[in-house]
Interface confidence: low
């Protein structure tokens, strides 16, 4: 006869490990007992359990409550055992010795591999600002046994670099993702992907990129200069910019205070019915925590087009 076993048994931390040992012999052969031992190169062989055909299972005190026979139905030639709730310390070499009648004794060794799935963590880098050079966006660390694979899934262009630290029974892997911040990256997901044989599927942690920026300011509203004439109602100037964090807007007049009746509402400057007193240089100020911008325009209110005696000025923007 011969022993049917497995060279390598792999189990995830906390699961039950089945250590197989099945004697395949002639129909008239019997298995008297199966002895299980842990084989340690430093500490030698330690008894784990004894499976006797007549007296049943005996477990050594070190493994009490942790070693069982597989559930029924059981074949009398099957000497396999279950090691409950595998821990990392269980990893190593095991031996089964089968005593048969009349063929004698057989033995086989197998290795138990306990996979320790990683628990990844993602740490964002320093605040990102447009105009920076290559900057750390995030780092992702995962520790496990064997060493996990840590990669990044994103549509954002960048570079990734990994380093690993070996511990006695595991390895920690840290991957960093560097990029050159630009406003187009705002709101883009940056996902750390951790792969490991002990995971049913990849673990993913997503960080949403925030890039601080402030766009150049410009002013709309002076496109048609002929609309800016005395008496016109509803004239407005709108300040155009964008930023992260969202910018605040303010309006001033370069050559004095804002004329009475001119109202500031966020990015928009609203005028009452136009008079020549509304002519002047208006400045839009845009700012956020990162920076500030300004854009100025010159408003020249045209004389009433129905009064040909009045001079007609032009509107210009700078």
């Amino acid at each position: 006869g011969e022993l049917e076993t497995s060279d390598l048994v792999t189990v995830v931390l906390g699961q039950d490990a089945k250590l197989p040992c099945f004697y395949r012999g002639d129909p008239d052969e019997q298995v008297g007992q199966v002895a299980w031992a842990r084989v340690d190169p430093n500490e030698g062989t330690r008894e784990l359990a004894l499976l006797h055909s007549k007296y049943g299972l005996h477990v050594s005190p070190a493994y009490e409550d942790r070693v069982e026979q597989p559930p029924p139905p059981r074949d009398p030639l099957d000497g396999s055992i279950l090691l409950r709730n595998a821990v990392q310390a269980d990893e190593g070499e095991y031996e089964c010795r089968v005593s048969t009648f009349p063929a004698g004794s057989f033995q086989a060794r197998m290795r138990l591999r306990v996979l320790v799935p990683p628990l990844p963590s993602l740490n964002p880098g320093p605040p990102l600002e447009e105009g920076q050079g290559l900057t750390l966006a995030a780092s992702c660390t995962a520790e496990g046994s064997p060493a996990p694979s840590v990669t990044w899934d994103t549509e954002v262009k960048g570079t990734q670099s990994s380093r690993s630290f070996k511990h006695s029974r595991s390895a920690a892997v840290t991957s960093e993702f560097h990029l050159v911040p630009s406003r187009s990256m705002n709101g883009q997901p940056l996902t750390c992907v951790v792969s490991h044989p002990g995971l049913l599927q990849d673990q993913r942690i997503t960080h949403t990129l925030q890039v601080a920026f402030l766009a150049e300011a410009s002013v709309r509203g002076l496109e048609d200069q002929n609309l800016w004439h005395v008496g016109r109602e509803g004239a407005t100037l709108k300040c155009l910019s964008e930023g992260q964090p969202p910018p605040k807007y303010n309006w001033t007049r370069l050559d004095g205070p804002l004329p009475s009746g001119v109202r500031v509402k966020g990015d928009t400057l609203g005028f009452p019915p136009l008079t020549t007193e509304h002519s002047g240089v208006y400045v839009c100020h845009v700012s956020n925590e990162l920076s500030s911008r300004a854009s100025q325009v010159t408003v020249e209110v045209l004389a009433d087009p129905e009064d040909p005696g009045k001079q007609v000025d032009l509107v210009s923007a700078s």
Epitope: D153, A215, E216
Partner: antibody, heavy 118, light 107 residues
Framework: QVQLQESGPGLVKPSETLSLTCTVS????????WSWIRQPPGKGLEWIGY???????NYNPSLKSRVTISVDTSKNQFSLKLSSVTAADTAVYYC????????????WGQGTLVTVSS | DIQLTQSPSFLSASVGDRVTITCRAS??????LAWYQQKPGKAPKLLIY???TLQSGVPSRFSGSGSGTEFTLTISSLQPEDFATYYC?????????FGQGTKVEIK
């Protein structure tokens, strides 16, 4: 030295689909973004779109409804399909590699002229 | 879309001349601008990226400057092999766009 080579039919009938392939040699397609750009005869350049080696894409909105870019990492190739073509799609089509910091097309194919005509 | 306007569209110059080409963006694009050279029947070749960084292998007579909305490409001393069409391109926002080109001809 990475080199790019476009291939595909030089003549396509109106309303049909234009199909081109770009083969990357001298280096791996992995880790970079790859783009298609076209240039009508005697005119300027127009960006069509890009693909990452993992398969994610970004297209020019003016062509988005008609464009598909795909990648085959096992063959080190990426491809362009442009459907419902008209004479206005007649152009030299270039494939190009996007620089690592998203700031330039640093390597270009030599280009292939595709004429749309019945 | 961001429009890039190059000026001039055509430029006649002699060998040894200093040549400057301007590219204006319809809105601020920080320094996300590249310059390419294209000769007839050939693919464009990268000269400058990030507005002012010289691509490896490109002669030092080429230089770029600018930020925001106004950029320039300068050829300090025009050589016979520099007669070509030059394009600027922005990477600040999608869709990425090119200027209409500046053709540098022999005077």
């Amino acid at each position: 030295q990475v080199q790019l080579q476009e291939s595909g039919p030089g003549l396509v009938k109106p309303s049909e689909t234009l199909s081109l392939t770009c083969t990357v040699s001298g280096g791996s397609i992995s880790g970079y973004y790859w783009s298609w750009i076209r240039q009508p005869p005697g005119k300027g350049l127009e960006w069509i779109g890009y693909i990452y080696y993992s398969g994610s894409t970004n297209y020019n909105p003016s062509l988005k409804s008609r464009v598909t870019i795909s990648v085959d990492t096992s063959k080190n190739q990426f491809s362009l399909k442009l459907s419902s073509v008209t004479a206005a799609d007649t152009a030299v089509y270039y494939c190009a590699r996007l620089g690592i910091f998203f700031d330039a097309f640093d390597i270009w194919g030599q280009g292939t002229l595709v004429t749309v005509s019945s | 879309d961001i429009q890039l306007t190059q000026s001039p569209s055509f430029l006649s110059a002699s060998v040894g001349d200093r040549v400057t080409i301007t590219c204006r963006a319809s809105q601020g694009i920080s320094s996300y601008l590249a310059w390419y050279q294209q000769k007839p029947g050939k693919a464009p070749k990268l000269l400058i990226y990030a507005a002012s960084t010289l691509q490896s292998g490109v002669p030092s007579r080429f230089s770029g400057s600018g930020s925001g909305t106004e950029f320039t490409l300068t050829i300090s001393s025009l050589q016979p092999e520099d007669f070509a069409t030059y394009y600027c391109q922005q990477f600040n926002s999608y869709p990425w766009t090119f200027g209409q080109g500046t053709k540098v001809e022999i005077k």
